[in-house]
């Protein structure tokens, strides 16, 4: 049954929202769908969830939400924001996750954003961004997961992620980035995750990714890339890569070799044509490998430390004859 | 902890050729650039180049191309630089660093002093 | 080759007192605002030991009494207080262009 203090609880649920006890004597708040223009005023200072989003929400007034200081989740996805004031987030000081999608936001909310330090997730995705400010992100340190995608970035914020040193995902796919340069993400130690899909970028500097010491995954697919990606040769702990659907036309000697970690390899839907011979070498823990139509192929390739592939497909290629260490490399 | 540990030092004829190693322990080895910085008394401070251990990476100072080649061993962890038709004005001490937070020289070999006479 | 110009070339400081060295950049060391200029400390017989790098950011271990600061072509090095342990030669560096350069390189003495 529920508690004297859950149905005190419950007496502070906004009209037409939806409340109930999250176990720790504080209170879920759903008001989502509701066709809301305005924030509810008669919040129970105990909310420790609040989901405000799908509603027609187009400003957020200077400190709307006073003393919640017990929220952790505030979710306003799928309004009509354009701007969030100075002050907006005012008192939350155990925010953690704050979900900002599907908004019309042209610019990251700096002002807004200061001092929520125990932010840990920030979804700003499909909004309008086209300009990320030096120091918007400088007061999260707490920040583990930024959603950046879907968005109208041009460039690398390469400034505004240097104060994310406990960042372990991010998402800067579904923009219109067309270079990385070298260092972009130069703080970034922790940074398990990153996709960079689906934008325009048909260069990358020789160190983009020099300073991701943790990363695992990095998705380059549906880019412009005329050239294999060997800037990915610091990545010692990656895991998965993908950079399907570029234009890559050819896989280079020792293309993998400072990512024995690696387990899939995605690089299908690129026109290309030759694969270094050592391109393969050295990775004992893939498991897939996928080469059609690389026409220049004309010799098997050595997978000397690549003992544990499970599926190797090699269609168009020019192989006449098959090495007879072949079947002593594969399982 | 990070160390960059090099061979000792080499005296050397005009003409000859020597092989300088730098070996690294503590950090994960093909992760970072090692550069090669070479030092002379009233000279300063001259970068060679870089090598990107275990990979065909290289970059060369254009002034040192014909002079030096480096090279890597993953196996036991060291970089080699290789100064070739050596001159009285190739003496000096040489170091190895590791390139680190956004391209600076966090680690620094102890050097290798390289004298050239007949 | 972007050439490094420090000065000046020697400095006396009493201890206790500021030390502050420039370098100076023949073209803009910025790149997508970063400064790609480092400091470095160099003892006789010893190798360079990285303080400052990125312009401004102290490595880590550096005492605070260093600090680094300019953009684009103009960068400072300040040592405040001095102490003994810092009679040194100090040296700038550039990344943000092959070939990467380094600064003449300015003594510091304490009186």
């Known amino acids: 049954g529920s508690s004297p203090r859950s149905g005190v609880l419950l007496r502070g649920c906004p009209t037409h929202c939806h409340c109930e006890p999250d176990g720790r004597m504080l209170l879920r708040v759903d008001c989502s769908d509701l066709g809301l223009s305005e924030l509810p005023s008669n919040l129970s200072v105990f909310t420790s969830y609040l989901d405000l989003s799908m509603n027609n929400i187009s400003q957020l007034l200077p400190n709307p939400l006073p003393s919640l200081r017990f929220l952790e989740e505030l979710r306003l996805a799928g309004n009509a924001l354009t701007y969030i004031p100075k002050g907006a987030f005012t008192g939350l000081y155990s925010l953690k996750v704050l979900m900002l999608q599907n908004n019309q936001l042209r610019h990251v909310p700096t002002e807004a954003l200061q001092n929520l330090r125990s932010l840990q997730s920030l979804r700003l995705d499909a909004n309008h961004i086209s300009y990320v400010p030096p120091s918007c992100f400088s007061g999260l340190h707490s920040l583990r997961h930024l959603w950046l995608d879907d968005n109208a970035l041009t460039e690398i914020p390469v400034q505004a992620f240097r104060s994310l040193s406990a960042l372990q995902a991010m998402t800067l796919a579904l923009n219109k980035i067309h270079h990385i340069p070298d260092y972009a993400f130069g703080n970034l130690s922790s940074l398990v995750v990153l996709h960079l899909h689906n934008n325009r970028i048909h260069s990358l500097g020789k160190k983009c990714f020099d300073g991701l010491h943790s990363l695992e995954t990095l998705d380059l697919n549906y880019n412009n890339l005329d050239e294999f990606p060997t800037a990915i040769r610091t990545l010692s702990n990656l895991k998965e890569l993908g950079f399907h659907s570029n234009n890559i036309r050819s896989i280079p000697e020792k293309a993998f070799v400072g990512n024995p970690s690696l387990i899939t390899i995605h690089f299908y839907d690129n026109p290309i044509q030759f694969v270094g011979r050592s391109a393969f070498q050295h990775l004992p823990e893939l498991r897939t490998l996928t080469l059609n139509g690389a026409s220049q192929i004309t010799e098997f390739p050595d997978l000397t430390g690549t003992a544990n592939l499970e599926s190797l497909t090699l269609t168009g290629a020019q192989i006449s004859s098959l090495p007879q260490t072949v079947c002593n490399q594969l399982p | 902890q990070v160390q960059l540990q090099q061979s000792g030092t080499e005296l050397m004829k005009p003409g000859a050729s020597v092989k300088i190693s730098c070996k690294a322990t503590?950090?994960?080895?093909?992760?970072?650039?090692i550069e090669w910085i070479k030092q002379r008394p009233g000279h300063g401070l001259e970068w060679i180049g870089e090598?990107?251990?275990?990979?065909?990476?290289?970059d060369y100072n254009e002034k040192f191309k014909v002079k030096a080649t480096f090279s890597s061993d993953t196996s036991s962890n060291t970089v080699y630089i290789q100064l070739n038709s050596l001159t009285y004005e190739d003496s000096a001490v040489y170091y190895c660093?590791?390139?680190?937070?956004?391209?600076?020289?966090?680690?620094w070999g102890q050097g290798t002093t390289l004298k050239v006479s007949s | 080759n972007i050439v490094l110009t420090q000065s000046p070339a020697s400095l006396a400081v009493s201890l206790g007192q500021r030390a502050t060295i420039s370098c100076r950049a023949s073209?803009?060391?910025?790149?997508?605002?970063?400064?790609?200029m480092h400091w470095y400390q160099q003892k006789p017989g010893q190798p360079p030991k990285l303080l400052i790098y990125?312009?401004?950011n102290l490595e880590s271990g550096v005492p605070a009494r260093f600090s680094g600061s300019g953009s684009r072509t103009d960068f400072t090095l300040t040592i405040d207080p001095v102490e003994a342990d810092d009679a040194a030669t100090y040296y700038c560096?550039?990344?943000?262009?092959?070939?990467?350069?380094f600064g003449s390189g300015t003594k510091v003495e304490i009186k």
């Open positions: 990125l312009a401004s």
């Open positions: 090598i990107l251990p275990g990979s065909d990476s290289t």
């Open positions: 560096q550039q990344n943000y262009e092959d070939p990467f350069t």
């Open positions: 073209e803009s060391v910025d790149n997508y605002g970063n400064s790609f």
């Open positions: 503590g950090y994960t080895f093909s992760a970072y650039w």
């Open positions: 660093a590791r390139g680190g937070h956004y391209g600076s020289l966090d680690y």
